[in-house]
Each structure stands twice: as C-alpha cells, then as structure tokens.
Interface confidence: low
C-alpha cells in the first residue's frame, strides 16, 4: 500500500478541514485507511478520521476542527493498519478554502436590471465574514459562447445586472463562488446554479417597423 499523491488539506476556517490524497491502486478507503490528526499544542487530544472514496483510488477525510486561529498547526498521520504511510503537518490559516455562498436568487429590479443576491456563508463574528470577495458566472443555457464573469469586490453579496447586456428571451443561469484575499485562499466551490428568463426587450423593438434596423 503506497500513497501516490500525498494528502493536501483545506480548511473552511470555521468548523471543518478536508484532506484528499490518491493511492497507487484502487483502495477501499474506509476499510483500509485511517487519518489521525492532533492540534500541535500541549494536552491536545488525538483524533481519527475515517476516509471515504471520491474515486476508486482517491480518498477524502472531513475533520471537525475547533474555530481556527492563525497559529494552529495540526500533525497528520496516515495509517494502513499499523503501517504509517505518510506523516505531515497542516496549518489551516495557510490553506483556506471558503465555504460555498448560499441561497443565490435573482430578482427583477428597477430600471431594467436584475438583482442577484446570495448569502455570506460565514457568521458575522467569524474572521472570514468581512474578507470574502465573490465571482459570479452568468451563462446562456443555449449558447456556450454567451457567458459573463463578474468580480464582486465590495462587501455586499449582491450584483446588479442590466437586462440589456443579456440576450432577450434567453434563459440564463448564474452561480457564485467566494475567495478570501487576505488569507490567500483558494476559491470556494461554485454555488448551485439558479436559472431565469431574460424577458427584457431592446428599446428599438418598440420603434415603428420601418425604423427597425437589423445589425449583422
């Protein structure tokens, strides 16, 4: 039994760290392996995580952790029975992957705009609550070439979108992900998509027919 790609771990910096690794052959992760983890601090308890299979040779462990502070370092040991396969350390504050933003909704707003809203996945008392910036991806469900990416660098989890920037009568989907710049985090996973019909009509369509120009 041998580790092909050693464990790499990310923390949501509030309650959970997730480690993933790849074995050199298909492995029943939960039956054959255990990941032990312990906060590198006097008197800290040793915990054991039972991994699950993500693919036939890729294992994933989700570890409950206390509300992390920057200096926290965990000692990790990967075991196959009595055999130590890998040993390493993990500092959650250096490997942050934010939680996924939630409850993405789209609302018609004044002046032919759509208001996209979502929820910050962190409570206000958490360090990351005020650190998140977002990326919103808006795509035409029937035209893969028609997509837009918006970086939301201000605090509020909202985006105003002019309906005129989207094709009239087309169905669009949006999804959002988060990033914590000061922690040099990775991006969160994408939120589930929300879909809506862009029923805005360009103003030219209301002109008398002989004034209506087609642009090619």
């Amino acid at each position: 039994v041998k580790v092909l790609h050693e464990p790499s771990c990310f923390s949501d910096y509030i309650s959970t760290s997730v480690c993933q690794w790849k074995m050199d052959h298909p492995t029943n992760c939960s039956a054959e392996l255990r990941l032990s983890y312990q906060l590198d601090f006097m008197g800290s308890e040793n915990h054991t995580c039972v991994p699950e299979n993500r693919e036939d040779s890729v294992c994933v462990c989700s570890m409950p952790i206390d509300d992390a502070v920057e200096a926290d370092v965990y000692q990790l040991d990967l075991w196959a029975g009595q055999q130590l396969l890998w040993s390493g350390s993990f500092q959650p504050s250096k490997h942050v992957k934010p939680r996924t933003p939630g409850n993405l909704t789209v609302h018609p707003n004044i002046s032919h705009t759509w208001l996209l809203m979502w929820t910050n996945p962190y409570p206000t008392e958490n360090h990351l609550h005020s650190e998140l910036t977002y990326m919103v991806n808006v795509s035409n469900d029937n035209d893969p070439e028609d997509f837009k990416v918006y970086n939301v660098t201000y605090m509020g989890p909202t985006l105003r979108l002019a309906a005129s920037t989207l094709k009239s009568g087309a169905s669009y989907s949006a999804r959002v992900r988060a990033w914590a710049q000061t922690y040099n985090s990775t991006w969160s996973d994408w939120s589930p998509s929300t879909t809506w019909l862009n029923y805005y009509e360009p103003w030219e369509q209301h002109l008398p027919h002989h004034h209506h120009h087609h642009h090619h």
């Epitope: 041998k2 092909l4 790609h5 050693e6 464990p7 790499s8 993933q20 690794w21 790849k22 050199d24 890729v58 390493g88 990775t186």
Partner: antibody, heavy 123, light 113 residues
Framework: QVHLKESGPGLVAPSQSLSITCTVS????????VSWVRQPPGEGLEWLGV???????YFHSALISRLSISKDDSKSQVFLKLNSLQTDDTATYYC?????????????????WGQGTSVTVSS | DIVMSQSPSSLTVSVGEKVTMSCKSS????????????LAWYQQKPGQSPKLLIY???TRESGVPDRFTGSGSGTDFTLTISSVRAEDLAVYYC?????????FGGGTKLEIK
C-alpha cells in the same frame, strides 16, 4: 553534486536476460526514487519502471512479466533485469532520479539522468 | 494507460522566432487535491540524455532559461520558446506523472533554419 551512471553488457543474444546497474552519488536511495527509461534508436522515450526509497516498485504494464528492479542502498546501486530479450529491446537504457519534494507536494518528474548505456539485442 | 500525444512531430524555425508545441493527454492530469498538473517537459539534444525543463506543467526547473514557458491545464498543454536560439536544437518530450505507468509523448523535433 548528483550523478547517475549506467553500466551494461552492450550486446545480448535474443532470449537471454539483460542486467544493467545504475550507480548513483549525491543523494540517498533511501530517500529518492530511481526510474528506468529506454530509447530505441531514432525513436522516443519509454518509461520502464521505478523503485522508490522504501523499495516499492512499479512497472510499465507491457513489461511487467519480464522486468524486475531492485537496489542496494548501501552501495548506492539500482539494478534492472529484463528477461527474454527480443530485437525490439535494442535501445539506450537510462536511469533517472525522481525529483525532490517541492512546495509540500511530491514532484515525480525526473530531474537528473544518467548518460545512458547502449544495448543491442542480436545473435 | 494514459496516452500522451505531441504535435507537431517536427518544426523548423529561424533563430529569434517564437515557437509553441502542443501536448495532449488522454486523461485529466490536474489533481484536485492540490490543483497541480502532473506534467513535465524534457529537452533532449542530439547525442545527449534528456534534461528536465518544466514540471507541474508550468514550473521552470532551476537553471532553465526564462525563454522556456510551460502552460495549460487538464488535458491540453503547451511549451513555448519565446525567442529560439541555435542551442535549442533538440527533441522536446512531455511526460505525465499523474499515474502509473508514467508515459511520454512521441516528441517534437525542433530544427533551426
């Protein structure tokens, strides 16, 4: 200074076995893996197999039945043995060190290579 | 086994020109655990052993001139030489180390006009 050097017989008769030794310096075989790669004349590179610091081995799927790789850590030597040679085993055989640990993850690229030893399979 | 395909098989350029060569993998080489692509590029000059140029698809090996750049992710990768020099005459190979058995592409032979 990392150095690898292959030594082989040069000429081997068909159906016989090929044995090549790779002698290394500048790193420990208990810490790093060594791969074997061959190159038929005028052709590309073909990975044959690897032996890791803990002694575990992995082989090219087409050669698994007739290839073995072993080592002597104390002598800093890695050994390749290929059985039942055919003419299409004619090639230059290289040993190469598997790369160092970088940025917290394993780098399995081959960062140092020997100069190669030419092997001809012919009667 | 993961199949690596390189194109073109050969190309001829003048000194100072920019060169790009392609490497495609039959399987994804991006490992989700660390967001790294397990792909290397090697240079083999005539009569010499291969030399490591790039690993992790885009990280230059120490001592390799910065005119060599690796890019790409997943299954499509590119090696670019920004301004070819006469000493770059060689065959360039890509290699995946995502899974066993490690496999090489067939090589791209760079010739100088």
């Amino acid at each position: 200074q990392v150095h690898l050097k292959e030594s082989g017989p040069g000429l081997v008769a068909p159906s016989q076995s090929l044995s090549i030794t790779c002698t290394v310096s500048g790193f420990s075989l208990t810490s790093y893996g060594v791969s074997w790669v061959r190159q038929p004349p005028g052709e590309g590179l073909e990975w044959l197999g690897v032996i890791w610091g803990d002694g575990s081995t992995y082989f090219h799927s087409a050669l698994i039945s007739r290839l073995s790789i072993s080592k002597d850590d104390s002598k800093s030597q890695v050994f390749l043995k290929l059985n039942s040679l055919q003419t299409d085993d004619t090639a230059t055989y290289y040993c190469a060190k598997q790369g160092t640990i970088y940025d917290g993850y394993y780098n399995y690229a081959m960062d140092y290579w020997g100069q190669g030893t030419s092997v001809t399979v012919s009667s | 086994d993961i199949v690596m395909s390189q194109s073109p098989s050969s190309l001829t350029v003048s000194v100072g020109e920019k060169v790009t060569m392609s490497c495609k993998s039959s399987q994804n080489l991006l490992y989700g655990g660390n967001q790294k692509n397990y792909l290397a590029w090697y240079q083999q000059k005539p009569g010499q052993s291969p030399k490591l140029l790039i690993y992790w698809a885009s990280t230059r090996e120490s001592g390799v001139p910065d005119r060599f750049t690796g890019s790409g992710s997943g299954t499509d990768f590119t090696l670019t030489i920004s301004s070819v020099r006469a000493e770059d005459l060689a065959v360039y190979y890509c290699q995946q180390y995502y899974d066993y058995p490690y496999t090489f592409g067939g090589g791209t032979k760079l010739e100088i006009k």
